[in-house]
Every structure is written in C-alpha cells, then in structure tokens.
C-alpha cells in the first residue's frame, strides 16, 4: 500500500510532444509502469513506457509525429492513463482528460547568439523551437545573465512580455566573461509553465579602450 | 473551492441495487476528476472507482469491478455510483471526492482534497 501521495503531471510543447511524470511516494522503483493516450477525435493511440528519474518519480515522452508537425487542437481532448504492471496484468493507477492548450510547457529556446558585443552591452538572439503556429505573437520571454561570482538563482529576471527573440543587454562590465539563458512561455492555457532554460551563452564584453596620455 | 454532498444511501438487500449520487457546488464542475470512496466500520477508507473530467475515462478497485459504475453529467453538477450485485462486504459509508482542478485521479485517498459528508449503504443478508 502507497501511504504517502501521487502525482500524475503531463505537458504538451504545442506540437507533438506530451511529457508525462508519475510520482508515487513509496511505489517500488522496479515496476513496470506505462503512459497511455486516448485522443477524443484522433485515430491514433499513444503509449510510452516510463521510465524512473529519481527515487519515487518516472518519465516519458508520448511521441505524436514529426517534431514540427501539429498533432493536437486548442479542442481536443486526450485521457491519459497511467498503467503499471501487477503479475500478468496492467492496472490503471492514474486517469485524466488532459487538454493539452491548458498544459503547455514548450522547448528551451535554441540557436543563442551574440549578434553585437561592446564594452557595456550585448545584443542577443535567439529561436523557439517546435511552438504551434497557434500561438501567433503570443509569447512571453524571461532572460537572466549569469556575472562573475554569482549563481543563476541570484541572476535577476529581465520579462520581455511579448514575442521579441531579441535582447540588448545593457550596464555590463568591459572585459567580463557572462552567460546568457532564455525561457519562453505561451500566454493561454490555465496549467501552461515556463519551458526549460535554453542551454547558456558564454559570451565576452570588449576591454575597455585605453586613456590616452596627455 | 468545491463542495459535494452524497444522497441515495440507505438499507438493501444481497443481490440489489442502488445509485448514489453526489451534488457538486463552486467551482466548475467540469474541471474535476470525480471518485468514490467507501469506510467500513473499522477499517481503512479504500478507493471504490474514479471518472475522469468529461467521463470519457474511468477505473475501479477490483473489488467492485464489473458490478458498480460511475458516471456524470456535467450540466447537472453530478457524479452518481450505480452499484449492483450488491453483496454484504459492501457495506460502508460512501464517500465522493475530488482533487485540486487539472489534476490526475488515483486510487490513492491522500490526493483527494475535497469530500463530501458521505452517506450510509447497508447491505443485508
């Protein structure tokens, strides 16, 4: 018997990707355990084996198609299961109607690149991978910029509230080694979260020029 | 927040029927999970079966397998528990529940954060 909690969380990248996590607090970390989709106006099914990630928890990835392809509407409905295997049959332990616009969680944004460096100020871009045509300019960013002798959790958020794949990064120190992450997120969706940091950016302010004699 | 409140318990005999309903208030109705779970006298509070959202999905603990069935109309705010077969064993306080909006239902009573009062079946001999 399972004395503490379970959770059951999935996400939808907009395209075809569903990310599922299982947690189940005392569960046994050798059991073999399932994601099942149902779409309500779809004739595929949809299964992934979970997989563990950490002491109680598993994870999968329902594979819907080719990356950029767009497999699910702002109108379907998919129930997701979760089955595990107890002797020669499965169980369901877990049962959702998952909309998949209100659970959204994109891809990490990709192809960071410094496009103009100086001494005080950066000009980066970057793209966003595998998001829905749905979406239109219905995006938001959060950047942070990791400094000498800091952490990223110190790195205050700059918010860029709309769909600008650009930043100028002002007030930097000359000769000064940072990096540079971006996440981005879709306005709709009540459980819709924030994507993955994208990988960093190191990048390097130029030196100052030197003061001539007088 | 989410209120809920059972009706349709009461006395019956090995081998009839009875259908419970439970009345939701709050929140929209249409955003739950719905499950049912029944008390004994002295045991434990066990899972009976669960319903997803739309009632497209549901699952239920072997015990009842095959001889209750959960269903809902959304317009009308309500999840009932047709229960047949009935059998002794079955006798327990019944209780509706539901978890936090958007979240999954399991078979597991610690993931239920709202309930009902519950009410009475009795199965006679």
């Known amino acids: 018997a399972v004395n503490g909690t379970s959770q059951f969380t999935c996400f939808y990248n907009s395209r075809a990707n569903i990310s599922c996590v299982w947690s189940q607090d005392g569960a046994l970390q050798d059991t073999s355990c399932q994601v099942h989709a149902w779409p309500d106006r779809r004739r595929w099914n949809q299964t992934c084996e979970l997989l563990p990630v950490s002491q109680a928890s598993w994870a999968c990835n329902l594979i819907l198609g080719a990356p950029d392809s767009q497999k699910l509407t702002t109108v379907d409905i998919v129930t997701l299961r979760v089955l595990c295997r107890e002797g020669v049959r499965w169980r369901v332990m877990a049962i959702q109607d998952f909309k998949p616009f209100e659970n959204l969680r994109l891809m990490a944004p990709i192809s960071l690149q410094v496009v103009h460096v100086e001494t005080h100020r950066c000009n980066i871009s970057w793209e966003i991978s595998q998001a829905s045509h749905y979406f239109e300019r219905h995006l938001e960013f959060e950047a942070r910029t990791l400094s000498p002798g800091h952490t990223w959790e110190e790195a205050p958020l700059l918010t860029l509230k709309q769909k600008q794949e650009w930043i100028c990064l002002e007030t930097l120190t000359p000769d000064t080694q940072y990096e540079f992450q971006v996440r981005v997120k879709p306005l709709q969706g009540e459980f819709t979260t924030w994507s993955p940091w994208s990988q960093p950016l190191a990048f390097r302010t130029k030196p100052a020029a030197l003061g001539k004699d007088t | 927040q989410v209120q809920l409140q059972e009706s349709g318990g009461g006395l019956v005999q090995a081998g009839g029927s009875l259908r419970l309903s439970c009345a939701a208030s709050?929140?929209?109705?249409?955003?739950?999970?719905m499950a049912w779970f029944r008390q004994a006298p002295g045991k434990e509070r066990e899972f009976v079966g669960a319903?997803?959202?739309?009632?497209?999905?549901?699952f239920y603990a072997d015990s009842v397998e095959g001889r209750f069935t959960i269903s809902r109309i959304n317009d009308k705010n309500t999840v009932y528990l047709q229960m047949n077969s009935l059998k002794p064993e079955d006798t327990a306080v019944y209780y509706c529940s539901a978890p936090r909006s958007g979240r999954a239902g399991t078979r597991n009573q610690m993931d239920y954060e709202y309930w009902g009062q519950g009410t009475q079946v009795t199965v006679s001999s």
């Open positions: 709050g929140r929209t109705f249409s955003n739950y999970v």
């Open positions: 319903i997803t959202q739309t009632g497209r999905g549901t």
